[in-house]
């Protein structure tokens, strides 16, 4: 997250981290039920660990943390790497969470966000595109949902209904390492960090997010059948 601020501890209890090896963060994720996460489909890896209830970027133990393995990764059937359409994936964890003040699911928004809606994006991603500076703790950033027209003007030929743009003034954006993390608007999960330009946080180059309102049925059906 570029030019965000430290999240309050336990204020994003649905925020997850996907880790390679013992503790290398590569993507964010969102807890949506006691045993299921959502992340971006482009975050798919054959082997990874899941960390929930953690505030710090470092692997130091925190009392609220819970660690899991992913036993099933189900990318949306319409996703085709390295495209951006339908960029979401369900992950089933090896067990259910212990519900606590640090670890809680978030409800998915059934209605699509409208222009001007204020939202919160969070993640442990780099705070500067070209230098890979990492925050000490989870970062939060208020962003505003942009109109479809402005979104399409920013990225001609690249935007479809499975995406929405959100941003703020130049200098504030999600960035590398935030992929798959949550965009929460009015207390409900509206999007996932998906893509954007490089470097992050350029004028007229907003972040682009998976438009989860388009996928509520697929998410429910897939969880029920697995």
């Amino acid at each position: 997250i570029v030019n965000g601020s430290d999240c309050q501890k336990d204020a994003q209890p649905w925020q997850g981290a996907l880790l390679l090896g013992p503790n290398k963060l590569y993507c964010g994720a969102v807890l949506i039920s006691p045993q299921w996460l959502l992340t971006a489909a482009h975050c798919r890896k054959p082997v990874f660990r899941i960390r929930l209830g953690h505030h710090s970027m470092s692997p130091v133990y925190e009392s609220g943390q819970q660690m899991f393995q992913g036993i099933k990764s189900i990318p949306h059937p319409g996703y085709s790497h390295p495209g951006h359409s339908n960029d979401l994936m369900l992950i089933k964890m090896n067990r259910k969470i212990r519900d606590s003040h640090s670890v809680k699911p978030v409800e998915i928004a059934c209605d699509c966000a409208t222009e001007g809606t204020r939202c919160m994006v969070s993640g442990w991603g780099t705070t500067s595109s070209s230098h890979n500076n990492f925050p000490k703790v989870l970062q939060c950033l208020n962003i505003t949902v942009l109109s479809e027209e402005r979104c399409k003007n920013s990225y001609p030929g690249q935007i479809d209904k499975t995406m929405f743009c959100a941003g703020d003034e130049e200098g504030r954006d999600s960035c590398q390492g935030d992929s798959g993390g949550p965009v929460v608007c009015n207390g409900k999960l509206q999007g996932l960090v998906s893509w954007g330009d490089f470097p992050c946080a350029q004028r007229n180059r907003p972040g682009v997010y998976t438009n989860l309102c388009e996928f509520v049925k697929w998410i429910k059906d897939t969880m029920n059948s697995n």
Partner: antibody, heavy 124, light 107 residues
Framework: QLQLQESGPGLVKPSETLSLTCTVS??????????WSWIRQPPGKGLEWIGN???????YYNPSLKSRVTISVDTSKNQFSLKLSSVTAADTAVYYC????????????????WGQGTTVTVSS | EIVLTQSPGTLSLSPGERATLSCRAS???????LAWYQQKPGQAPRLLIY???SRATGIPDRFSGSGSGTDFTLTISRLEPEDFAVYYC????????FGGGTKVEIK
């Protein structure tokens, strides 16, 4: 299948500007999933990254060459170009163009498609 | 600037043998941001490994990558005749750079 082809003069005089073009076929340059790179290799030596250009035309250059390098894109021709000014004999090399992939995960996908390279000699 | 040092400079081995190539960074590099390439004479480099340990499309499983921090390794479990080439590591954690290369030659 995506292919990259470098083109440009094989001989450049010292102090002049080296200009090369990379033509992309079998795919489109204006894609928000990819960046486009120039890399060079002096005779008998290793690889040196020169710079990248991204979807919006934003660029990222090797700090040691930054003052002399310009990378640009012409989407109408599906080409991107390299200009290196004030060349010396040390700029004699095989110049490669390549494609890399990027997203907002914290992950480097490497450069998966390369041109075959074009030899540029700097000599009077 | 992150400097990558590859060793050995030349590795003389026979087909069927195991090759272990080292890449050492002057400062810590995220393993997610390290790649390996193979280059044969007169050809462009070919991507072998990305993210330190993931094989690129079409790369046989005799090639494997490992490591973290400042020390990374490319291993070729059983050398085939077509594997004799120069191998480069690359980091993209900060301003991208390549190692000096390791030549794997027939003994």
């Amino acid at each position: 299948q995506l292919q990259l082809q470098e083109s440009g003069p094989g001989l450049v005089k010292p102090s002049e500007t080296l200009s090369l073009t990379c033509t992309v076929s079998g795919g489109s340059i204006p894609s928000s999933s990819y960046y486009w790179s120039w890399i060079r290799q002096p005779p008998g030596k290793g690889l040196e990254w020169i710079g990248n250009i991204y979807y919006s035309g934003s660029t990222y250059y090797n700090p040691s060459l930054k003052s002399r390098v310009t990378i640009s894109v012409d989407t109408s021709k599906n080409q991107f170009s390299l200009k290196l000014s004030s060349v010396t004999a040390a700029d004699t090399a095989v110049y490669y163009c390549a494609r890399g992939e990027y997203d907002r995960s914290y992950y480097f996908w490497g450069m998966d498609v390369w041109g075959q390279g074009t030899t540029v000699t700097v000599s009077s | 600037e992150i400097v990558l040092t590859q060793s050995p400079g030349t590795l003389s081995l026979s087909p069927g043998e195991r090759a272990t190539l080292s890449c050492r960074a002057s400062q810590s590099v995220s393993s997610s941001y390290l790649a390996w390439y193979q280059q044969k004479p007169g050809q462009a480099p070919r991507l072998l490994i990305y993210g330190a340990s993931s094989r690129a499309t079409g790369i046989p499983d005799r090639f494997s990558g490992s490591g973290s921090g400042t020390d990374f390794t490319l291993t070729i479990s059983r050398l085939e005749p077509e594997d004799f080439a120069v191998y480069y590591c690359q980091q993209a954690f900060s301003s991208p750079s390549f190692g000096g290369g390791t030549k794997v030659e027939i003994k």
